[in-house]
Structures are given as C-alpha cells and as structure tokens.
C-alpha cells in the first residue's frame, strides 16, 4: 500500500522519513511542528524568495505572508509558475515562459501574441506591385516582380545598385530585367568587352547572337 511519506506531508520544504509507526519530518531552519507547518521565521529573516514581498510576522508568534511577483507561487514564492502548462500558444506555437512575460514562438505561417493568426492564406493576402502570393511548407510568401522586394513587395529594389555595367556603361532598371547601354567602344551584356578600332571585338570567343553594343537580354 501507499507509504506514509507518499505525497510528502512535510510542509515548507521539510523532508519526510518513515518510522516504524508513521513518519517524521525534518524541518528546515525556522520551521517546526509535526509537519513543519509552524513558522518561527519573521519578515526580518527575509523568507520570501524571487522578489516576493513579506507582510506581517513582526514577532516569532505571528505568521508572515509572502506576496509573490508574477510567475512565482508557494508560501515563500519558491515555486515558479509554469504558465506554459495551460498551453496558451495556438497552432503548435512554442511557449516560452520568460518570468516577467510569456512569449509564443509561432510556427511558419502563423503570427500574433498567441499565434492565433493564420497567414498561410493567399486568398486574404495582397502582394503589391504585381507580386504573387506563394503558399507552401506551412507558410506563405510574396514572389515579387522585378524591381520590388520586401515582405509585401512594397519596397523598391534597384537591380542597378550593384553597378553591373562595366566601363562606364549605363544600367537601366527595365521591368524585364536590368539593361546595360554601353559607352562607345565597349560591347557585351555587361559592356565587358572592348571593341577594337577595326570593328573587331576582344571577345575570347564571340558568344552567339552577341553584337557590338548589345544590351543585357
């Protein structure tokens, strides 16, 4: 059958040991009684842990009460409250108890303080500037048209920012892709090849379809 120490009858952190007849509690400092239920501790002893506020207990005969801060419980605020046991995060979100606050780390495709918003729905999602919404892997994303970027394709991206056209060539941000207009004397998709005075180019081997001054296709 169940032993007398099952369920730990000793309060206030006392340790239970079985005796031939029953059990015996070995009480921590400041506690006494059969089950260590009587406190000899006062607020002067600072019995409240984890920032708990002690009230009462000015003399050995009067009890004290610990008012615990959020996230802690127990007569001495010694126990951390497991707020994640209530499973507050929805849609498979990971619960993180930071003590001062609760955080939900949401799975891809979900958002909100409790992961309550389902983002994996292209029907209700607008991608700006000609972008298209793509679903997959439990998430969604906007596939942006050329020249745009960001979460909703609202940010302008300049394909010419990296200065891809060599030898002073001009880069234009055309909707079909970047375009190089080469300075006189150069040719190639990126204006990388000089054109010799006789009209021949310095191409190691002329790529098919590449003419002097050809733009990027």
């Amino acid at each position: 059958g169940p032993g007398p120490c099952d369920g730990n009858p000793c309060a206030n952190g006392g340790s239970c040991s079985e005796t031939p007849r029953s059990f015996e509690c070995t009480c921590p400092r400041g506690f006494y009684g059969l089950r260590c239920e009587v406190s000899g501790v006062t607020c002067a002893d600072g019995p409240c842990f984890n920032g708990g506020l002690c009230v009462g207990g000015a003399d050995p005969d009067s009890a004290y009460i610990c008012h615990c801060p959020p996230g802690f419980q127990g007569s001495n605020c010694e126990k951390r409250v497991d707020r994640c046991s209530l499973q507050p995060c929805r849609n498979g979100g990971l619960c993180l108890d930071l003590g001062h606050a609760l955080r939900c780390r949401c799975r891809a495709g979900f958002a909100g303080p409790r992961c309550e918003h389902d983002l994996d729905d292209c029907a209700g999602r607008a991608c700006a500037n000609g972008g298209t919404c793509v679903e997959g892997g439990g998430a969604h994303r906007c596939s942006c048209a050329l020249g745009f970027g960001g979460r909703d394709c609202r940010e302008r991206a300049d394909p010419c920012a990296a200065r891809p056209c060599a030898h002073g060539g001009r880069c234009y941000a055309h909707f079909s892709g970047l375009v190089c207009a080469c300075a006189p004397g150069y040719m190639g998709a990126r204006c990388e090849f000089p054109v010799h005075p006789d009209g021949a180019s310095a191409l190691p081997a002329a790529p098919p379809g590449l003419r002097p001054g050809d733009p990027q296709r």
Epitope: G147, R156, D158, C160, R163, R170, C171, Y172, A173, H174, F175, S176, L178, V179, A181, C182, A183, P184, R211, G213, D214, P215
Partner: antibody, heavy 118, light 109 residues
Amino acid sequence: QEQLVESGGGLVQPEGSLTLTCTASGFSFSSSYDMCWVRQAPGKGPEWIACIYTGDGSTDYASWAKGRFTVSKASSTTVTLQMTSLAVADTATYFCARNSGYGYFGLWGPGTLVTVSS
Amino acid sequence: QVLTQTPSPVSAAVGGTVTISCQSTESVYGSDWLSWYQQKPGQPPKVLIYQASNLEIGVPSRFKGSGSGTQFTLTISGAQCDDAATYYCQGYYSGYIYAFGGGTEVVVK
C-alpha cells in the same frame, strides 16, 4: 501609380530665361533611369532636348541644346530644365519623360506649355 | 542621327492594314533599340513597341514592329477607328543619344 508632372511653363519674352520642373510620384530617382526632357512645337513632332542619368548624375544633350539648356536633379523626385536666351522658335509643349530601358520613353508627363513672345 | 518616316499621311479603311516605315541614317544601339509611339491631340506620346518588335504591356496585338539596324516597320493589322493618330518612331544611339522621326499621320475611314 507612377507619374510625372511638369510645371513652370508660361509666357516669356525673347532672350528671357525659364526653369521647368519635373516632379515624380510613385517612384524616386534612387533607381537608375534617364530622366529626360522632350519638346514638341505646335503641329510638329517630338524633339529630344536632354537627359540626366540618375545612376551617377551624368547628363547628355542634343547638339542644338548645348549651352542654352541645363538639366539637373534637384531632389530624389524632381528634375529641372533651365532654359536661357529663349527665342520664338522655342515655343513648344515641354514634356518630362523617363527611359526605363531599351532607350524608349515608357512614362511621360502631361507637358507644360512655354510661349516665347514679345 | 536622323529618322525619316514614310509615308505621311496614310489612309486606311476600318479593318485594313497600315504600314509605316522608319529609316535611320545610322544603326540604332544594339541594332534594335527603336520604339514606336502613338500620339493623339493634346496628349503625350504613348509607347506601342520597344526594342523594334516588343509589344508594350496593354497595347493591342494588332500593332506589330519589325526591322533592325537602320530600317524599321510598324504594321497595324485590322485598323480600328481608335487608331487614327500620328505615329512616331524613336531611336536610341551609341553615346546615349535619342532622336525622333518626323511622324506619320494615320487616317482611318
């Protein structure tokens, strides 16, 4: 919506000066374009005047426009055209236009009329 | 750089075909950086074709561009009343130079 709007046109006397402004909305000159000025005299075809390349600020002019016309970038959304020693023959609608690649003007403003007359 | 357009004016019946040619005194950049515009009174030019043969977004497929180097053609197949306008070719040349043709007036009857 990307738009261009010209302003600053009006009546000016021969040998006078005028500055036209092109204001962009829906985009800025942080991307690389040729922002250009094109004019069209009454009953005539369009005539290219000048461009400023927003990538590095370099400018290009029609041979006839060098010296009297100056194109510059005033801000990330405005380009200006300064015109001096204006003649009656400069009477035209002045358009601001953007080359977005392949050397064509895909975006135009509605134009501003400049009349040179005494 | 001079662009010469022929003929002007040109007349066509509704449903007919209109052909406009544009000749350049020198080759355009990349041999195909030539565009075509349509202009109606009181409006700026509107691009129809870029890079000699590419149809601009939103332009009806009855407009077709062809050619390379110095010789280019705009063809309107199945002309509509709304196509009555003046058409211009425009080239881009090495050295970052632009030029427009003189224009071709199209009358649709």
